[in-house]
Interface confidence: medium
């Protein structure tokens, strides 16, 4: 063996943001010829020795961080990056507004504000774009999201979520969409790969390989992916927190 077994990838299809009661599939992908996969939910004793986990209806208890690895012979691979599986629709949707308004001149400034009546300390802003279900979207954990020196690339549809740092994988429903229009430019907006399309039940037979049920905190199967900055913290954008522990 010339090097360590490369880490597998772990994906959530069609998205890692899953509305309650909607389906999602977790897929661990390693090189060809893998002897055994191990897919586990972190900070719990739940695991399965399969590459694919089909969740027919998202539950609060299934939200959290997942990781997988694989075995070839007696060797185990390095673990995959952690996957943050988020249940959305747990709380009422926040409101998203643009100050001074949703129409802004190219080169100007605009601030998107996500507001909620509840005591949430975390907010996530997404820009809708071309489907990119395997890529973590840009995320800022702040209530106000200033966009300085606006360009055509900022045009598009935005949504925000609110949640609590005490339960970082249980999110609100998405806000109503906000359409940001950049005027004074003829350049076609670039579509930034951000929020995946809303999950829908479009699983083929090949995708729905495993159905999950929990028995004694072990995945039993039937064949059939911190900084969590509060609104008062840094103005700089922070990526999604890979806190793979129960906060």
């Amino acid at each position: 063996q010339s090097g360590p077994l490369p880490k597998p990838s772990l994906q959530a299809l069609p998205s890692s943001l899953v509305p309650l009661e909607k389906p999602v599939t977790l897929r661990c992908q390693g090189p060809p010829g893998v002897d055994l996969y191990r897919l586990e939910k972190l900070s719990s004793s739940r695991y399965q020795d399969q590459a694919v986990l089909f969740i027919p209806a998202m539950k609060r208890s299934l939200a959290g961080r997942y990781r997988c690895s694989y075995q070839n012979g007696s060797l185990w691979s390095l673990p995959s990056d952690q996957l943050e599986l988020v249940a959305t629709g747990v709380f009422a949707k926040p409101s998203l507004s643009a100050q001074p308004g949703p129409a802004v001149s190219s080169g100007g400034d605009v601030t998107l504000q996500c507001q909620t009546r509840y005591g949430f300390d975390q907010f996530a802003l997404y820009k809708e774009g071309d489907p990119a279900p395997y890529k973590n979207p840009e995320r800022w954990y702040r209530a106000s999201f200033p966009i300085i020196t606006v360009t055509a690339a900022h045009s598009g549809t935005y949504r925000c979520y609110s949640f609590s740092s005490r339960d970082p994988y249980l999110w609100s429903a998405p806000s109503d969409p906000l359409e940001l229009v950049v005027t004074g430019t003829s350049v076609t907006p670039s579509r930034l790969p951000t929020e995946p399309p809303s999950p829908v039940a479009e699983f083929s037979e090949a995708t729905a390989e495993l159905t999950v049920s929990f028995t004694n905190e072990v995945f039993t199967t039937e064949t059939s992916r911190s900084i969590t900055a509060s609104p008062k913290e840094s103005d700089s954008p922070a990526g999604p927190a890979r806190q793979y522990y129960t906060k």
Epitope: P4, K7, E40, L42, S43, S45, Y47, S69, S74, W76, L78, P79, D81, K135, N136, R225, S226, I227, A238, G239, P240, A241, R242, Q243, Y244, Y245
Partner: antibody
Framework: QVQLKESGPGLVAPSQSLSITCTVS????????VNWVRQPPGKGLEWLGM???????DYNSTLKSRLSISKDNSKSQVFLKMNSLQTDDTARYYC????????WGQGTSVTVSS | DIQMTQSPSSLSASLGGKVTITCKAS??????IAWYQHKPGKGPSLLIH???TLQPGIPSRFSGSGSGRDYSFSISNLEPEDIATYYC????????FGGGTKLEIK
């Protein structure tokens, strides 16, 4: 060939900030995370934090309020910033690749002294 | 946070002999433990990950075992170049090193 190399100021005054750069080669920062670890003189290794391939971060909970890790993928550089340094922050600082840290730099020595 | 208690803090053994180091986690770490060799003036070297998987190029006289909260690391047929400090690392929940074990040869 995977390589990591740390560069730092060497000497920092108490209450000031520390900035260290880790320059990597042989792998892409978009596909691998980078950790920061330190070793005070005569003591053991202490994990400081990590930046993942997608730019997200994790920090040692006891140091989280003073730490910031960022990166520039195009320059293959990862940056550690630590605020409000005290003499017990004197240590050798290492960067290391991903989990569970399969490649390490040689480290850079940082002394906090007036 | 998970704590890792490593013992002994130092040990001395004869060439050709065998030594065992243990690490106990404050909670179940599901085999996510790695072992490192650290020599002065160098960065640490990964020897074993996921409890027992040897890194490429690491001789088989290095071994690891364990599950749950209790893990061990052994070196058999000790050689002079094994003089170093050895650390365990849990990476189940953030990352935590053990306190280290300084190995000396009699």
């Amino acid at each position: 060939q995977v390589q990591l190399k740390e560069s730092g100021p060497g000497l920092v005054a108490p209450s000031q900030s520390l900035s260290i750069t880790c320059t990597v080669s042989g792998f892409s920062l978009t596909g691998y995370g980078v950790n920061w670890v330190r070793q005070p003189p005569g003591k053991g290794l202490e994990w400081l934090g990590m930046i993942w391939g997608d730019g997200s971060t994790d920090y040692n909970s006891t140091l989280k309020s003073r730490l910031s890790i960022s990166k520039d993928n195009s320059k293959s550089q990862v940056f550690l910033k630590m605020n409000s340094l005290q003499t017990d922050d004197t240590a050798r600082y290492y960067c290391a690749r991903d989990l569970p840290m399969d490649y390490w730099g040689q480290g850079t020595s940082v002394t906090v002294s007036s | 946070d998970i704590q890792m208690t490593q013992s002994p803090s130092s040990l001395s053994a004869s060439l050709g002999g065998k030594v065992t180091i243990t690490c106990k986690a404050s909670q179940d770490i599901n085999k996510y433990i790695a072992w490192y060799q650290h020599k002065p003036g160098k960065g640490p070297s990964l020897l074993i990950h996921y409890t027992s998987t040897l890194q490429p190029g690491i001789p088989s006289r290095f071994s690891g075992s364990g599950s749950g909260r209790d893990y061990s690391f052994s070196i058999s047929n000790l050689e002079p170049e094994d003089i170093a400090t050895y650390y365990c690392l849990q990476y189940a929940n953030l990352l935590t090193f053990g306190g280290g074990t300084k190995l000396e040869i009699k």
